[in-house]
Each structure stands twice: as C-alpha cells, then as structure tokens.
C-alpha cells in the first residue's frame, strides 16, 4: 500500500574539524521509494558538487573535506507524491584548532611611546590568546594589556620591555605558538653629565668630561666657539650603554665648549647638547679701563643690525670682551632659530643693542641701554609667546649657563625715554619683508584699520591689532 | 618747549566738512606719533585716530573709519584732521596729543603733551 | 576690542585719604597702560606710564600697579589740587581705549 515518507532518524548536530569528513543521515520509510532533497541554509545542494557525496538513495550527505565556511543548518526533504514532504534539519558545528592568521613581527620603538604587537587568531571554539616573554609568561599590568584581538599593547614603552616575545592561541582541540619576535626598545640621547666651566690661567691644561647614554649608544661631538674641535685630544669610553667623552685642552683663549650626544633612530636623529665656558683669569687689556672701553663693532654676528662702523661698549670683566660678547650673542642667535619670523627680527635687534650697548666715549667709557620702552614692545608686542617661555625656562633653571640671562635684558630695570631721551638708546627701525611674512599672529579679534607700509596687510590676520599688546 | 596747537573748529551742518589741524613745536613729528581725541560735552576721552609719520602708518576709531583721515606734513610740522560726513555726534572738543616714539613704542610712552583744545559743533 | 572698565566711575574722599582707582581689561592687555588727571574746561595730563611708571613733574604720592588684567592708580594722600576726573587709557598698535573716568570730589 502506498506510505507517506516518515524520517526515522531525525537529523542531529554534527561536529567536525577542518579537513575531515562529516556526514548527516536522514533514514525514511516510505513506500513508493521517495525523492530525497539537501539544503544548507536553505540553499539547494546540487547533486553533482563533488565536495559532497550523497548515497544511500540519498538518506546519506558526506562532506568529504570539512572547510569551516561548511557551518550551518543541513535539512533533508523526503517527498514521495503520497501525503506531504517531510523535513528534518541538524547543524554543522566545524571545529577549527587555534591558527595564528596574523603573527607579530619584529618591532624598534622609541622609550616612552606605544607598542602594539599583532596575533589575530581563528578557531572554534574561540581560541584564548597568551603572551609569553623571554620563557615566561607575560603577566599583564597597568602597561601591559592583551587586547580582545589577541595583540599585546604595551603603554609608555620602558627599557626593561625589550626583549623576546611570541603570542599563544589555545582552545579545547589545541594550542598554536607564533614564531619568536624582537621588541627593540629605542632611548633619545640624553646627557648624563654635562661639562663644567672653568676659570684657569692663560696656559693651562683642562679637561672637560662629558658622558651620555642611550639606545643605541650615541655618539659625542665636541663643538669649540660654534666650530668643530680643531685642537685638543679627546678619549672615549663605552661601559653598559654610556658613552664617557673626555677633552683636554690646552687653553690660550676663552671659549664656549659643546657636548652634543646623538643617536640615529630609523631615519631621524635625536640630539642632547650641554655647554660649558672657558674663561681666562687675570686676562685683561692692556692700559683700559678695567670697566671697559668704546671701540668699532668688528664682529660677524651683529653685522645686519648694529649700525656700520657702531661705536660699541666692550666690558672687560670678560677675559677677550670682544671674543666673549660675540660667543654671547651667537649662543643666544642660535636659539633664535626656533622662534616666529614675527619675533626674530625684533629679538636679534634687542639682542645685539643689549650685549652690544651703544658706548659713550668720554673720560669715563659709559654703555647706552636700551630704552625701556623699545625692549617692552620686543617683549609684549613682537615676541610675547616666546619671551614667556625663554623666562619659564630660566626659572625652572633649564639653562645651564648665565649666558640667557644676561642675553635678555630685564626691561623694567631700564631707563625710560621720559627721563632722559639722551640716556637710552632706541631700537633702529623693524623692516618686516612682506615675502617672508605671511601673517603677524592675531592676537586679539579686535581690526582696526591699519595702513602699515612694511607690514603684510591682509584684511583677516595679518595685522589685528599685532604684533599687540593684547595677548590672549 | 614743546607744544601742540590744534586750530580749524567751528560750526558745521550735518554731512558738512572740516578740517583741523595741530601745529607742533619744540619736537619734531615725524619721530613721534600723533594722536586726535575728542570729548563730547559732559562726557569721557575718546580716542579718534594716530599717525606715525616714521611708518606712514594710521589708524582710526571704529566710530570715525572711512569718514576722517589723519595726516601729517613733516616739513611743517603739522598734523591733520579731515572730517568728512560729519554727524551730530561728532560734537566735541577735538584734542591733539603726542607720544614719543614710533608706533610700536608710544603706546608706552603715555599720551605726554596735548593741545588746549579746538571745538566743534555738528548742527543744522 | 579691548573695553577698560573703570570703578568707581565717582567717589567722595576727604584730603588726606588714601584713593584707589582700577581699570579692568576685557581681555589681556600689556602693561602699556596710563593714567590721567583732567580738571574741568582742561586738557589731561599724563600721571602714570607704562603701567607704573610716575611721569616726570607728578607728585610721588600718585602710583600705579598691574595685577594681571586689573590696572590701579593710587593717591596715598589726597590733596587739595587732586580734586579731577581720572581716566586710564591702553594702547595696542593702535587701537587705543579710554575707561569711562572716575570723579574725585570733596566729601
């Protein structure tokens, strides 16, 4: 008699790892024989995909190499035109051993940045993800984090975390390790003890003893008067990282001796300079005041600013004043580098009017300062961001020598125009290259109309109210 | 000796002209900068405009821009006002001051001589 | 642009006292403040400069400070002839403002 197709053997969830064989079964009864269909996630499985085998008048489907996209919902459907289609349906779970997809790989990091050292995973069950160090496991900190994506992030990289590191993926069916990597752990070259200046007699031998360190180990140059050492012997050590320099001299004339310390990170640099001073003592001119005389400016530094043939004041509390006031001003140029084109020009000027004062020549030589006035308007109007920081630094003692100090004049201790117009001296005229300036800084958002010949005069920027007084 | 004297005030109708000027001796303008303000009857200091003839450079008041212009004439020794479109509220007494200096130094200097005063009347 | 806010803008003193003025900046300024006298039917005159600096004829009992964006004039012992209106002014490059003045009268 005919029969309905019944399913005898409902389908059940299958597990099966990569690369082995999975194998549903949908046993009927039915009479006539029926027609027996497969579907995985109700997409129909074609007859002839010879990644499957289906057998037994198609109760039996053979996944013959298990890939873990094969997951999913399997039903069979056995029709055989008496009654309805009957269904039954059961899942593939592919389970997968841990698998490293993407591994770590060797790292150079500056001290004091982030690290991230990839391991993406793939397993099923999920694999969890360990880190060992060295031969032990990396146990994770405030620094030290295992992300959700299996990489090792490590905050504000110190030295002690270079070294061997390789990522672990473990799950229920077993544990892959990725290959050994190399966390290098780059440090900025840094001074450790700077150079001392001294005060010796013409003559005598010094040493100067500079050391640094750093990853890798810098190297140290030796800088005379701006210029590379062109005598003297130098001697050098390296012990655990630090570098210990040694230069002797053989002293004739004062100078301004620089330790610089570099190191080669990738492409870049990184530098750490520290300076120290060689007086003469009881080095004096000859039949001059022992305050000190007027003479013509010869030097090199100075030239664009101070007026041709300028009559300057030379001090001779310095050994060679015209040397030394020269290695001042240079020393102070230099920084100069580094500030606003707005500033520079207006600084230079008060720069070399100040360490250069205008002499009155008479019986008694006498410096010119410069009127108060002029050296607040350098400092308020032209270079206030930068005056605010050279001053925070010299509090915080972050310059080594007086050579700051006495560079930047203290403009309340100087004489004022209302007093005697003769007594201070005036600032020559600023001329701002209109190519070279693009913008004064906008300080306020105050516009007035302003004509102003020398200056850059676009209508937003240019000139609000700047260089200004109002510093916001 | 150094003084300032302002002259040309008077009485003009509303859109009418004027201009004033301020004689300088016993100091050279073209070192120093040169400032208008006025005072309306009853009322506080208000800054018109400044000229640096060192700079060329000028400057106006909000209130005044585009209808007044300073100028100076070195070789007389004279600053300018020339007040155009004048207005009922430009009533006042029109100072001339100086400041030693350049534009960028005046402003330290403080405002050190100023003229008596010239009055002028916006009225139809 | 930059407001100097005067106070007070009159006060009543008796000669002899000690007298404060103060200008507040709307913003920050630089210390190229000053500070002037000026009697009635009169041009002003220049006390202070820069701030604190006394202008070269005022008497010593008149002072000036800074404290941030506050401007003070001082008149530590007020005298006779100091009766006036008193007006700060700052300078930028240019734009120059004037507080609204402060009246010194006899109490």
């Known amino acids: 008699l005919p029969k309905a197709p019944v399913i005898t053997t409902p389908l059940e969830t299958v597990d099966a790892l990569v690369e082995e064989v999975a194998t549903f079964m949908c046993a009927v009864e039915s009479y006539p024989q029926p027609e027996i269909s497969w579907t995985r996630n109700k997409i129909l499985i074609k007859l002839f995909d010879t990644r499957y085998s289906i057998r037994e008048n198609g109760q039996l489907l053979t996944i013959l190499s298990v890939e873990d996209s094969d997951d999913g919902i399997y039903c069979c459907t056995a029709n055989n035109g008496v009654g309805g289609a009957v269904e039954s349906c059961g899942a593939l779970q592919v389970k997968m051993k841990p698998k490293i997809t993407r591994p770590p790989i060797n790292v150079k990091i500056i001290e004091g940045l982030k690290a991230v050292l990839p391991c993406t995973t793939m397993g099923n069950p999920k694999p969890s993800v360990s880190w060992i160090k060295g031969d032990s496991p990396l146990r994770e900190n405030s620094r030290i984090a295992v992300l959700e994506s299996g990489s090792l992030r490590i905050h504000n990289v110190q030295k002690e975390d270079a070294g061997q590191y390789r990522c672990v993926a473990k799950n229920s069916l077993g544990t892959a390790y990725s290959k050994v990597v190399k966390l290098e752990v780059e440090v900025f070259a840094r001074i450790l003890r700077a150079p001392e200046s001294h005060n010796v007699t013409f003559g005598s031998f010094v040493t100067l003893h500079c050391t640094a360190t750093g990853i890798p180990v810098p190297t140290i140059t030796w800088i005379e008067n701006g210029n590379a050492v062109s005598s003297g012997s130098i001697q050098e050590s390296v012990k655990d990282r630090v570098i210990d320099s040694r230069l002797q001299l053989f002293i004739t004339k004062p100078g301004l001796y620089t330790c610089i310390a570099t190191n080669k990170h990738g492409e870049k640099f990184s530098t750490a300079k520290a300076a120290a001073t060689i007086s003469i003592a009881e080095w004096s001119k000859p039949q001059k005041d022992n305050k000190g005389y007027c003479a013509q400016y010869r030097g090199e530094v100075c030239n664009a600013v101070l007026a041709k043939d300028a009559l300057v004041f030379l001090n001779t509390s310095y050994a060679d004043p015209e040397e030394a006031q020269e290695l001042l001003v240079h020393t102070a140029w230099n920084e100069l580098k580094v500030v606003s084109p707005v500033c520079r020009p207006a600084a230079e000027a008060l720069l070399c009017n100040h360490i250069f004062q205008e002499c009155s020549p008479g019986v008694v030589p006498t410096p010119i300062p410069i009127c108060r006035e002029y050296c607040l308007a350098v400092k308020e109007l032209f270079c206030a961001k930068e005056w605010l920081v050279m001053e925070e630094k010299t509090h915080r003692g972050l310059y080594r020598s007086e050579m700051h100090l006495l560079s930047v004049p203290e403009c309340s201790k100087l004489p004022s125009m209302h007093w005697d117009p003769t007594a201070c001296a005036r600032l020559p005229h600023l001329d701002y290259n209109k190519e070279n300036l693009k913008t004064f800084p906008p300080m306020t958002s105050s516009k007035p109309s302003v004509d102003i010949p020398n200056l850059p005069s676009s209508s937003s920027s240019s000139f609000s109210v700047s260089p200004t007084y109002s510093m916001t | 000796e150094v003084q300032l004297v302002e002259s040309g005030g008077g009485l003009v109708q509303p859109g009418g002209s004027l201009r004033l000027s301020c004689a300088a001796s016993?100091?050279?303008?073209?070192?120093?900068?040169i400032h208008w303000v006025r005072q309306a009857p009853g009322k506080g200091l208000e800054w018109v405009a400044s000229?640096?003839?060192?700079?060329?450079?000028?400057s106006y008041a909000d209130s005044v821009k585009g209808r007044f212009t300073i100028s100076a004439d070195t070789s007389k020794n004279t600053a300018y006002l020339q007040m155009n479109s004048l207005r009922a509220e430009d009533t006042a007494v029109y100072y001339c001051?100086?400041?030693?200096?350049?534009?960028?130094?005046?402003?330290?200097?403080?405002?050190?001589?100023w003229g008596q005063g010239t009055l002028v009347t916006v009225s139809s | 642009d930059i407001q100097m806010t005067q106070s007070p803008s009159s006060l009543s003193a008796s000669v002899g006292d000690r007298v404060t003025i103060t200008c507040r900046a709307s913003?920050?300024?630089?210390?190229?403040v000053a500070w002037y006298q000026q009697k009635p039917g009169k041009a002003p005159k220049l006390l202070i400069y820069s701030a604190s600096s006394l202008y070269s004829g005022v008497p010593s009992r008149f002072s000036g400070s800074r404290s941030g964006t506050d401007f003070t004039l001082t008149i530590s012992s007020l005298q006779p002839e100091d009766f006036a209106t008193y007006y700060c002014?700052?300078?930028?490059?240019?734009?120059?403002?004037f507080g609204q003045g402060t009246k010194v009268e006899i109490k």
């Open positions: 001051a100086r400041s030693e200096g350049d534009r960028y130094v005046s402003g330290y200097m403080g405002m050190d001589y």
């Open positions: 000229i640096s003839s060192s700079y060329g450079s000028t």
């Open positions: 002014q700052q300078s930028g490059v240019w734009l120059i403002t």
């Open positions: 913003q920050s300024v630089s210390s190229a």
């Open positions: 016993g100091f050279t303008v073209s070192s120093s900068s």
